[in-house]
Amino acid sequence: MAVTACQGLGFVVSLIGIAGIIAATCMDQWSTQDLYNNPVTAVFNYQGLWRSCVRESSGFTECRGYFTLLGLPAMLQAVRALMIVGIVLGAIGLLVSIFALKCIRIGSMEDSAKANMTLTSGIMFIVSGLCAIAGVSVFANMLVTNFWMSTANMYTGMGGMVQTVQTRYTFGAALFVGWVAGGLTLIGGVMMCIACRGLAPEETNYKAVSYHASGHSVAYKPGGFKASTGFGSNTKNKKIYDGGARTEDEVQSYPSKHDYV
């Protein structure tokens, strides 16, 4: 029950996380114009991974995509790549995890197969979350570097007011969405990996058997060994096959002609 809950919760958390990563990747507000110590303007600038926007004080907004691919900064391309890889891995992970869910029966899929699929999806979610966190962090680092570079290039403007030569940009909403989403995907992945351990079937418990050799009056029962060593924790001894060897319980329940002289 706990395994099913852990797996289900891991799936839901990862699903929310990946939805967040997609949302962050599509959002325009990765960097927003820093309004602190800025000359009062009627316009506000903000940029995303795919386009840049200008918003008027009236609310009217105009956006333009980055049409050139070669002219874009390498860092921006790297962030785009990390986010896309994160989305793709997350989407594949979700697909795999749907079939791995314990509450869903697909044909005669064994628990070992479900455990493997759960582990695979968990690893995919972890990598997906890490990609998103890395992408957002690289972009944030780029913003911080540019912010302090523009701050260093200051000049004294009219009225003795200190101004920057370039407009400074600060963290946009997409960065926070990306960090949270990446974290959720990562947590979901860890939960899936934990659930996998519970799904994996334990090693086969070999039943204690009585070997009956005709002509001998004493049956060899290795039950004492089982009890003393702690092996064979399985209490439900099921009848596996009929033959010369029988389970301990069977021998005790059904005496044979070899048991007594």
Partner: nanobody, 123 residues
């Protein structure tokens, strides 16, 4: 990279009008935010007006608001600045500038610049 050439400057009387043009060499003119800056003798660069890619948003310095109008014709790859009710303090070298992603009043944000055109306001 885009090359910008200004024209239309000259001598004008106070209260007069003048229309500046800025021709861009690049056919990707529509993918640039454009701006006009001016520099009076012994002064720094001052933002005059700016316009977004398709001309939907325009920004003006308080000193020129209501007197100057910025416009662009993407089909002709040309930027315009219509200057009315000119004053003596409007006399300066006017520069056309371009940048790809932001409409700002800071000269450091503009990557491409023209050589400038002189505007003299005198009676």
């Amino acid at each position: 990279q885009v090359q910008l050439v200004e024209s239309g400057g000259g001598l004008v009387q106070p209260g007069g009008s003048l229309r500046l043009s800025c021709a861009a060499s690049d056919s990707t003119f529509s993918s640039y935010i454009m701006g006009w800056f001016r520099q009076a003798p012994g002064k720094g660069l001052e933002f005059v007006a700016g316009i977004t890619w398709s001309g939907g948003i325009k920004d003006y310095a308080d000193s020129v608001k209501g007197r100057f109008t910025i416009a662009r014709d993407n089909a002709k790859n040309t930027l315009y600045l219509q200057m009315n009710s000119l004053r003596a303090e409007d006399a300066a070298v006017y520069y056309c500038a371009a940048n790809a992603i932001q409409l700002t009043r800071r000269s450091g944000d503009y990557a491409y610049w023209g050589q400038g055109t002189q505007v003299t306001v005198s009676s």
